[in-house]
């Protein structure tokens, strides 16, 4: 089949990184600078994407693949091809499909990315809440009431929160 196709269409022999040049008797010509063809048999090369402004180059364009962009610090990509940049959320927020939203009561996020996580449940470890949680900070667990006798050790570190998921893109 490949051989038949080649006989019918000489352009099918042109590999990625080239185009079938009708102006030169359908010879396979290399893609000009700042252009690429990612598949064989193409009659034109595509213009390389330029990462400008808030977009910065993550991967340079080559003759066989387009450039890839990401966003400058403080911003993150939206979409598979990073077609838009969105400001990172503040601490105490999480990224949802509708943008940055404050953490619900009982949850926190101490980073500018990721999701809001539930406050540590001190009572599960037989401890009491020493410092209340906020949208930005987890609760601090202290010794249980029974441990508050003289000579008992003071604050224990909070139990590890559950692993944060990935923010939606």
């Amino acid at each position: 089949f490949e051989r038949t196709r080649s006989l019918q269409d000489p352009c099918s022999n042109c590999p990625a990184g080239t185009f079938c040049d009708n102006n030169r008797n359908q010879i396979c010509s290399p893609c000009p600078p700042n252009s690429f063809s990612s598949a064989g048999g193409q009659r034109t090369c595509d213009i390389c994407r330029q990462c400008k402004g808030v977009f910065r180059t993550r991967k340079e364009c080559s003759s066989t693949s387009n450039a890839e962009c990401d966003c400058t610090p403080g911003f993150h990509c939206l979409g598979a091809g990073c077609s838009m940049c969105e400001q990172d959320c503040k601490q105490g927020q999480e990224l949802t499909k509708k943008g940055c939203k404050d953490c619900c009561f009982g949850t926190f996020n101490d980073q500018k990315r990721g999701i809001c996580r539930p406050w540590t449940n001190c009572s599960l470890d037989g401890k009491s809440v020493l410092v209340n949680g906020t949208k930005e900070r987890d609760v601090v667990c202290g010794p249980s009431p029974a441990d508050l006798s003289p000579g008992a050790s003071s604050v224990t570190p909070p139990a590890p929160a559950r692993e944060p998921g990935h923010s939606p893109q």
Epitope: G53, V54, L78, G79, S83, M84, C85
Partner: antibody, heavy 116, light 107 residues
């Protein structure tokens, strides 16, 4: 806060040129493309082009390619849009806008009136 | 160039009404669609970007949906301050292009 402040209204004669400025504040000017959009009286929005302040590179709408020049002065965080050979149908409000793939901040607009 | 067609071009509605504006692209623009609100004598304001993401400070009664070529802006319960003109705009390819606008007027 992030702000774009444009130069004041202009009245020009047909055939003349106009240069509108757009001063950015509250963010790193060189880090975002600046786009220009115009709106004729009672009409919709029309994209004119963009400049990358970091490099000075431009993209123009084919419709304006031979008449528009976009420049910038990074030392004063200002972008400029110059339109030459003005015609009466260039009478419009000209806006600059910061780009993130969407225009999140706009200037207040500059009315350019072309009249003999 | 990618053509953006908005409908209706104008509509009359009352406070509390649910309002839907549609925008159609002449080719696939994935989710690269933004919505702006403009009031007379003022610059446009970003409402929604990337089809459905609400810009900061925009009330949650505004929502966006769609993908590919067909998109919708919905105002769940129209408020007095929502009477304005709304524009869609694609960011898939240069030149950036806008829809013709939809003017939302008081019935």
């Amino acid at each position: 806060q992030v702000q774009l402040v444009q130069s004041g209204a202009e009245v020009k004669k047909p055939g003349a040129s106009v240069k509108v400025s757009c001063k950015a504040s509250g963010y790193t000017f060189a880090g975002f493309e600046m786009h220009w959009v115009r709106q004729a009286p009672g009409q919709g929005l029309e994209w004119m082009g963009a400049i990358d302040p970091k490099t000075g590179g431009t993209d123009y709408n084919q419709k304006f390619k031979d008449r528009v020049t976009m420049t910038r002065d990074t030392s004063i965080s200002t972008a400029y849009m110059e339109l030459s050979r003005l015609r009466s149908d260039d009478t419009a409000v000209y806006y600059c806008a910061r780009d993130l793939g969407y225009f999140d901040v706009w200037g207040q607009g500059t009315l350019v009136t072309v009249s003999s | 160039d990618i053509q953006m067609t908005q409908s209706p071009s104008s509509l009359s509605a009352s406070v509390g009404d649910r309002v839907t504006i549609t925008c159609r692209a002449s080719q696939d623009i994935r989710s690269n669609l933004n919505w702006y609100q403009q009031k007379p004598g003022k610059a446009p304001k970003l409402l929604i970007y990337y089809t459905s993401r609400l810009h900061s400070g925009v009330p949650s009664r505004f929502s966006g949906s769609g993908s590919g070529t067909d998109f919708t802006l919905t105002i769940s319960s129209l408020q007095p301050e929502d009477f304005a003109t709304y524009y869609c705009q694609q960011s898939e390819k240069l030149p950036r292009t806008f829809g013709g606008g939809t003017k939302v007027e008081i019935r």
